[in-house]
């Protein structure tokens, strides 16, 4: 079974668009659109800070840290109201991701 051009292998994702807004000091807002080809029972998400197919039940429960969204060595915490998550680097720098 060979993939057609533009067709993704099952269980993989690719970034389609990436917009960055660095107009505010010490703050970069990034919005990305991804295309995924996921196994049954999976949905597009984030693993190790990259687009990935994740267990669809994670999205339903909003247990975002169960996607393993942070890099290895970073700490993951849910935002209030489970509106997203933060990844805290060992040095203390925090990256916040909100789900819309």
């Amino acid at each position: 079974q060979f993939l057609k051009e533009g067709q993704l292998a099952a269980g993989t994702c690719e970034i389609v668009t990436l917009d960055r807004d660095s107009s505010q000091p010490r703050r970069t807002i990034a919005r990305q659109t991804v295309k995924c080809s996921c196994f049954p029972g999976q949905i597009a998400g984030t693993t190790r800070a990259r687009p990935a197919c994740v267990d669809a039940r994670i999205i339903k429960t909003k247990q975002w840290c169960d996607m393993l969204p942070c890099l290895e060595g970073e700490g993951c915490d849910l935002l209030i109201n489970r509106s997203g998550w933060t990844c805290t680097q060992p040095g203390g720098r925090i990256k916040t991701t909100t789900v819309s």
Epitope: G11, F39, L68
Partner: antibody
């Protein structure tokens, strides 16, 4: 980076037993942690998985027979009411994408009168 | 529930020869298949993930192929240290499932 299981021993049927998996060199909360067992001379059987939040999923045959739980530093497997069929080496193993990249050396559980 | 049929259950090979192990899935697993090597008294070690992606440190004589329901592990130029039991594992959905294993003896 490594895993080590402990708690395996000879138990009598029906006596609950808890096995513990300890990680070195990485954080358990950055991985999905699994338990897999292997009866003497037999193949590998996946028992179940625990997510960072504590959410668990089990193989159909393992539901009710095993309980997986975790702390910040360990992952436990409780064999609720062991029978002779549960005699096996029990491994903990980590995953991110569904395959097991690091395994512990295993701990032997023998269930006998 | 996924079932993985691994063949043959055992085989004997000569040093320098080629070994082929097959894994047949009861349903399409979308190339979500891994292969492990296990030696007596030791835990399994990951050889290949995603059907054909060789793990770091695994000799290039090991290779994997397949799609859909049919998958193959090939060891080309078999060495004495390749004597072991090999398992396939599917991970497209829960429960995660293993094949029954293939015991490889080297003559």
């Amino acid at each position: 980076q490594s895993l080590e299981e402990s708690g395996g021993r000879l138990v009598t049927p029906g006596t609950p037993l808890t096995l513990t998996c300890t990680a070195s060199g990485f954080s358990l909360s950055s991985y999905y942690m699994n338990w897999v067992r292997q009866a003497p001379g037999k193949g590998l059987e996946w028992i179940g998985i625990i997510y960072p939040s504590g959410t668990t999923y089990y193989a159909g045959w393992a539901k009710g027979r095993f309980t997986i739980s975790k702390t910040s530093t360990t992952v436990d497997l409780k064999i609720t009411s062991p029978t002779s069929e549960d005699t096996a080496t029990y491994f903990c193993a980590r995953t991110v994408s569904g395959y097991f990249d690091i395994w512990g050396p295993g701990t032997l559980v023998t269930v006998s009168l | 529930e996924l079932d993985l049929t691994q063949t043959p259950p055992s085989l004997s090979a000569s040093v320098g020869g080629t070994v082929t192990i097959n894994c047949l899935a009861s349903e399409d697993i979308y190339s979500a298949l891994a292969w492990y090597q296990q030696k007596p008294g030791k835990p399994p070690t990951l050889l290949i993930s995603g059907t054909s992606n060789l793990e770091s440190g695994v000799p290039p004589r090991f290779s994997g192929s397949g799609s859909g329901t049919d998958y193959t592990l090939t060891i080309g130029g078999v060495q004495a240290e390749d004597a072991a039991t090999y398992f396939c594992q599917g991970y497209s959905s829960y429960p995660l499932t293993f094949g029954a294993g293939t015991n490889v003896e080297i003559k």
